[in-house]
Interface confidence: medium
């Protein structure tokens, strides 16, 4: 029986050229998380495997950074990044939990390039 719930950042917005953190948290279950997939519609952005660590899809490696936690950071946003993002938790023995985030990237009237930052 799947008892867990996923909390996400929900509907969020950011400006073109900026950065965003996508964050999910699985609670209310004792199931072991074996892997978390981050997907944009039907595209795989990144995988965090409990044993193997992070893998960023090659087509996103210049704009995607792992963390904080099991979250994902998107940088140098474009209007084309607008859309649904999914965190997919693979757990044992429960199975799969999915969280949804909707990101809207807005045209920036202030600055063309958003600030970047480091995740220590």
């Amino acid at each position: 029986m799947m008892t867990g719930t996923i909390e996400t950042t929900g509907n969020i917005s950011a400006e073109k050229g900026g950065s965003i953190i996508l964050q999910c948290h699985l609670s209310s279950t004792t199931a072991q998380v074996t892997q978390v997939n981050w997907e944009q519609q039907d595209q795989l952005l990144a995988i965090c495997n409990a044993d193997l660590g992070w893998h960023i899809s090659p087509s996103f490696k210049d704009r995607v950074a792992p963390g904080p936690g099991l979250g994902l950071t998107l940088q140098s946003l474009t209007v084309n990044d607008t859309g649904e993002y999914f965190c997919i938790y693979h757990t044992y023995p429960d199975g799969t939990y999915t969280g949804r985030i909707f990101l809207e990237v807005l045209e920036s009237s202030v600055a063309e390039h958003g600030a970047r930052f480091q995740i220590p």
């Epitope: 950065s19 948290h25 609670s27």
Partner: nanobody, 115 residues
Framework: EVQLVESGGGLVQPGGSLRLSCAAS????????MGWFRQAPGKEREWVAS???????WYADSVKGRFTISADNSKNTAYLQMNSLKPEDTAVYYC?????????WGQGTLVTVSS
Amino acid sequence: EVQLVESGGGLVQPGGSLRLSCAASGNTFSGGFMGWFRQAPGKEREWVASVLRGGYTWYADSVKGRFTISADNSKNTAYLQMNSLKPEDTAVYYCAKDGGWFDPWGQGTLVTVSS
């Protein structure tokens, strides 16, 4: 546009404490995420801590066990309680709401840890 106003910084001795506040206003989604970042002189801005509306928190390794992030969603305000401060914590601290942060940033609040 979201306006963010950080406050609570100041000069403190090593080992001391400070509590930073960040008040958010303006049009925003109700994502419920808030985070703190900092920028030390001559360094890149770095992520410090994050909190989700359910109270889940994440911290950079450098502050884990010393800093505590919290948020009062009814007041659209985030807090950063900083204990056992070290000279290397000296920086301008900024907050971000809903996971998005833009240029220009808010003015931030300066924290100086020095004896």
